[in-house]
Amino acid sequence: CDLPQTHSLGNRRALILLAQMGRISHFSCLKDRYDFGFPQEVFDGNQFQKAQAISAFHEMIQQTFNLFSTKDSSAAWDETLLDKFYIELFQQLNDLEACVTQEVGVEEIALMNEDSILAVRKYFQRITLYLMGKKYSPCAWEVVRAEIMRSFSFSTNLQKGLRRKD
């Protein structure tokens, strides 16, 4: 499956929206930095099959959607930007779902990509626990926003790589 160019553009738009969502100076949040242990190896295109990488992207976007759909998130961010962000994520989920089912049969996906999906879920679990521990403070959200931007950037680069391999 050739990931459509629109998906890459959507990813870029999502990144721009995330960048625009910032509300406070990043400089005041340095002490809240945290190692979430981004599962970089899951997205390593050389080590894993394309279908696995795509399903890991899918899980990451799904988890991002879940994270930013909470009431705590709604209170933290601008509603208009958040709505636009949801739309981008939803579109990307649709693109990736079509891609995954085209790569392998639906019934094989769950088994084949269980480890990578679990790694992504654990990563987001750490993010959620961090936010809870920080009582969803503005700085905690800033740190999480920066982290999600980094993981999105990473997956965007890998998607470019996957398209090139085709």
Epitope: K31, R33, A146, M149
Partner: antibody, heavy 121, light 107 residues
Framework: EVQLVQSGAEVKKPGESLKISCKGS????????IGWVRQMPGKGLEWMGI????????RYSPSFQGQVTISADKSISTAYLQWSSLKASDTAMYYC??????????????WGQGTLVTVSS | DIQMTQSPSSLSASVGDRVTITCRAS??????LNWYQQKPGKAPKLLIY???SLQSGVPSRFSGSGSGTDFTLTISSLQPEDFATYYC?????????FGQGTKVEIK
């Protein structure tokens, strides 16, 4: 390959203005902050200030506040350090270095080669 | 501002020696501490970040430890290329501040 390339050495007279540059390549320039560090001859490292190129938000060390201006042009992936009126005591090597911002990653992992500024009448 | 104090300011050692440099912060900085190596005429090089994480490409003879206010950089077996000046730097709050440096010289 990640690189920070600084502009060349400068020889200036007291009272003159100067703007030195630091061009980033091989990475997303707006995803990292750029810090500036001064090293006077035979002395240690002094942290001057930092800029977030994504929005040009800047912070200075109290020792350098009002003495220098840090800026960035994200369209050409370049950060700047400037003086409006140089003093002999500004003679030093100036380094730029990148910082991962709020992300958990190595701080100041890449440095420019340094720009030697000599101020003498 | 957070003050960073390194000790000793200089030391003489031989190849193969175990070398320890300490850094003390004027207030707790958790584990937000970096160590740099600088050779004459060169830009500083990051060795250790977050108190104990070894930067990619740095030999494993370098290690860092500590948290709160007291930190240590250890070179387990000094090599000829390790003769340089070492700086600690706090990274928890602006302005970031460096220690005054420790010069490691050949005995």
């Amino acid at each position: 390959e990640v690189q920070l390339v600084q502009s060349g050495a400068e020889v200036k007279k007291p009272g003159e203005s100067l703007k030195i540059s630091c061009k980033g390549s091989g990475y997303s320039f707006t995803s990292y902050w750029i810090g500036w560090v001064r090293q006077m001859p035979g002395k240690g490292l002094e942290w001057m200030g930092i800029i977030d190129p994504s929005d040009s938000d800047t912070r200075y060390s109290p020792s350098f506040q009002g003495q220098v201006t840090i800026s960035a042009d994200k369209s050409i992936s370049t950060a700047y350090l400037q003086w409006s009126s140089l003093k002999a005591s500004d003679t030093a090597m100036y380094y730029c270095a990148r910082h991962p911002g709020l992300n958990w990653a190595p701080d100041f992992d890449y440095w420019g080669q340094g720009t030697l500024v000599t101020v003498s009448s | 501002d957070i003050q960073m104090t390194q000790s000793p300011s200089s030391l003489s050692a031989s190849v193969g020696d175990r070398v320890t440099i300490t850094c003390r912060a004027s207030q707790s900085i958790n584990r937000f501490l970096n160590w740099y190596q600088q050779k004459p005429g060169k830009a500083p090089k990051l060795l250790i970040y977050a108190a104990s994480s070894l930067q990619s490409g740095v030999p494993s003879r370098f290690s860092g430890s500590g948290s709160g206010t007291d930190f240590t950089l250890t070179i387990s077996s000094l090599q000829p290329e390790d003769f340089a000046t070492y700086y600690c730097q706090q990274a928890i709050d602006l302005p970031f501040t460096f220690g005054q440096g420790t010069k490691v010289e050949i005995k």
